[in-house]
């Protein structure tokens, strides 16, 4: 709390200029007046106040505001969001887009905080869907935040949203929301030609069933073994040697480098060691020649 | 090139007065606030005055204060540290230096000049 | 505020892992900032904001810490890198620094 005392004469503050810069703590608290404040708040970003000043222009607005800032101030926050508590946050209704970017800005460069992820929540809750141009702005500023969402929470991103993402939007996704995402973008994609699908769908292969990879090995789309080492274990299981050769193209080498890592290893120990050998990779530890394969969950299932 | 150059700073008696200058370039100096810090041999740094970037608005360290006038002319695009009434304590290195953005609370300094050493003796 | 650096001065050999701190009376959020100074030069801004790396300042360099400490990591200490560092708190004026620490070559 800072003491209330007395403005001294001639710093009664009449606009928020650069005048205020130096001032001490208790001459912002005794000479600014909160209502000056919050009508020229797109004024205090342009001040370079220390974070000690930002506290008491806080302070000031939270008198102000007790229930939470109208939207008319959070756009002009500026440096002050810096001061904010998920707390604080969490009384805000952003409905603004334009709000949101002004906000993260702010913070450019630096780790998602628990103010702008709080902030980001209450966005996205208040929309009701993480449509494409959140999403756009999101990932523009913060390139991992579709994978800090739980399988549910992207449950409710629209199919059209999927086009903003972008390859290193992915990058630290799990299988569990790759298995969420990728039906989207399928959806998403569905109308593109063959080569321009495969680059889209690409990033998104990791929750790709096997039924759809078996298809995109008829279709010549080489792929690299970065992509393929992000396969389900489970999807790539059921291929043949025949469809990972086609699925691979040239990359097919590839696999000699990475026969000791899933998931290569569980597949190659599915394969029949005489399929393995047509690729003269020298891949080891496919099923001897002349033992039969009993696939006891085929069986489970039937009975 | 960005880059800051003091001079001014030379041989005073205790009680006596001097000018120091910096010249800036490479960057739109009126948009910075900048300071002066100072080091005396072999010790720390001490932050000795800072100037909004108008002009308009000055701070200065309690054992400066009274004493030295911090000021700016943004057409010469060059800060000055008007300094009098000089004691013995005063001899240091002078480093003018901008503040790291034009906005913000960040107070530190991503550009300094190499000093100018100032000495108060008898 | 002050700010207490610590060790004053520390000696270390090339390769070595080396860590200076610095605790500020009173808690001042993520507002430090760390400077390296060599002798007859003027002092270089390494990390801002207790952890945020300058642009071209080497990755071995670090920093951690929030409210009243602080900590400068250098991971693989270079020849170049024996030198005083500064840190410097920015969260109220009056501006202030620590003592310095000297690295020095063992």
């Known amino acids: 709390e800072v003491e209330k005392t007395a403005c001294p004469s001639g710093k009664k503050a009449r606009e928020i200029d650069e005048s205020l810069i130096f001032y001490k703590k208790w001459e912002l608290e005794a000479c600014v007046d909160a209502a000056l404040l919050a009508t020229q708040m797109d004024r205090v970003n342009a001040i370079p106040f220390t974070y000690e000043q930002l506290d008491v222009l806080k302070h000031k607005l939270d008198e102000l505001y007790p229930q939470g800032y109208p939207e008319s101030v959070i756009q002009h926050l500026g440096y002050l969001f810096l001061k904010m508590s998920p707390e604080d946050i969490r009384k805000w209704n952003v409905t603004s887009l334009e709000t949101l970017k002004a906000l993260l800005e702010v913070n450019k460069g630096h780790e998602m905080s628990p103010q702008v992820a709080t902030l980001i929540d209450r966005f996205v809750k208040g929309r009701g869907q993480l449509d494409k141009d959140t999403l756009d702005t999101l990932t523009a500023f913060y390139p991992g935040y579709l994978c800090s969402l739980s399988p549910e929470e992207l449950s409710s991103v629209p199919p059209s949203s999927i086009w903003a993402v972008r390859p290193q939007d992915l990058d630290t996704c799990d299988p569990r929301q790759l298995d969420v995402l990728y039906p989207k973008a399928r959806l998403a994609f569905q109308n593109m030609n063959g080569s321009e699908y495969f680059v889209k769908i690409q990033s998104f292969l990791g929750g790709a069933p096997t039924e759809d990879l078996k298809a995109l090995s008829q279709q010549n789309v080489s792929m690299d073994l970065a992509t393929f080492m992000k396969l389900r274990t489970d999807a790539v299981l059921p291929l043949t040697v025949a469809e990972v050769q086609k699925l691979l193209g040239p990359h097919v080498e590839g696999l000699k480098a990475e026969e000791r890592h899933r998931p290569v290893r569980d597949w190659i120990l599915r394969q029949r060691q005489d399929d393995l050998d047509t690729l003269g990779l020298g891949l080891q530890g496919g099923i001897p020649n002349g033992y039969l394969v009993l696939d006891l969950s085929m069986q489970e299932a039937l009975s | 090139e960005v880059q800051l150059l003091e001079s001014g700073g030379g041989l005073v008696q205790p009680g006596g007065s001097l000018r120091l200058s910096c010249a800036a370039s490479?960057?739109?100096?009126?948009?910075?606030?900048m300071s002066w810090v100072r080091q005396a041999p072999g010790k720390g740094l001490e932050w000795v005055s800072a100037?909004?970037?108008?002009?308009?608005?000055?701070y200065y360290a309690d054992s400066v204060k009274g004493r030295f006038t911090i000021s700016r002319d943004n057409s010469k695009n060059t800060l000055y540290l008007q300094m009098n009434s000089l004691r013995a304590e005063d001899t240091a290195v002078y480093y003018c230096?901008?503040?790291?953005?034009?906005?913000?609370?960040?107070?530190?300094?991503?550009?300094w000049g190499r000093g100018t050493l100032v000495t108060v003796s008898s | 505020i002050q700010l207490t650096q610590s060790p004053s001065s520390l000696s270390a050999s090339v390769g070595d892992r080396v860590t200076i701190t610095c605790r500020a009376s009173?808690?001042?959020?993520?507002?430090l900032a760390w400077y390296q100074q060599k002798p007859g030069k003027a002092p270089k801004l390494l990390i801002y904001?207790?952890?945020s790396l300058e642009s071209g300042v080497p990755s071995r360099f670090s920093g951690s810490g929030s409210g009243t400490d602080f900590t400068l990591t250098i991971s693989s200490l270079q020849p170049e890198d024996f030198a005083t560092y500064y840190c410097?708190?920015?969260?109220?004026?009056?501006?202030?620094f620590g003592g310095g620490t000297k690295v020095e070559i063992k």
């Open positions: 100037i909004s970037g108008s002009g308009g608005s000055t």
């Open positions: 904001d207790a952890s």
């Open positions: 009173q808690g001042i959020s993520s507002a």
């Open positions: 230096a901008k503040r790291w953005g034009k906005d913000g609370p960040y107070w530190y300094f991503d550009l």
């Open positions: 410097q708190q920015f969260n109220n004026y009056p501006l202030t």
């Open positions: 490479g960057f739109t100096f009126s948009s910075y606030a």
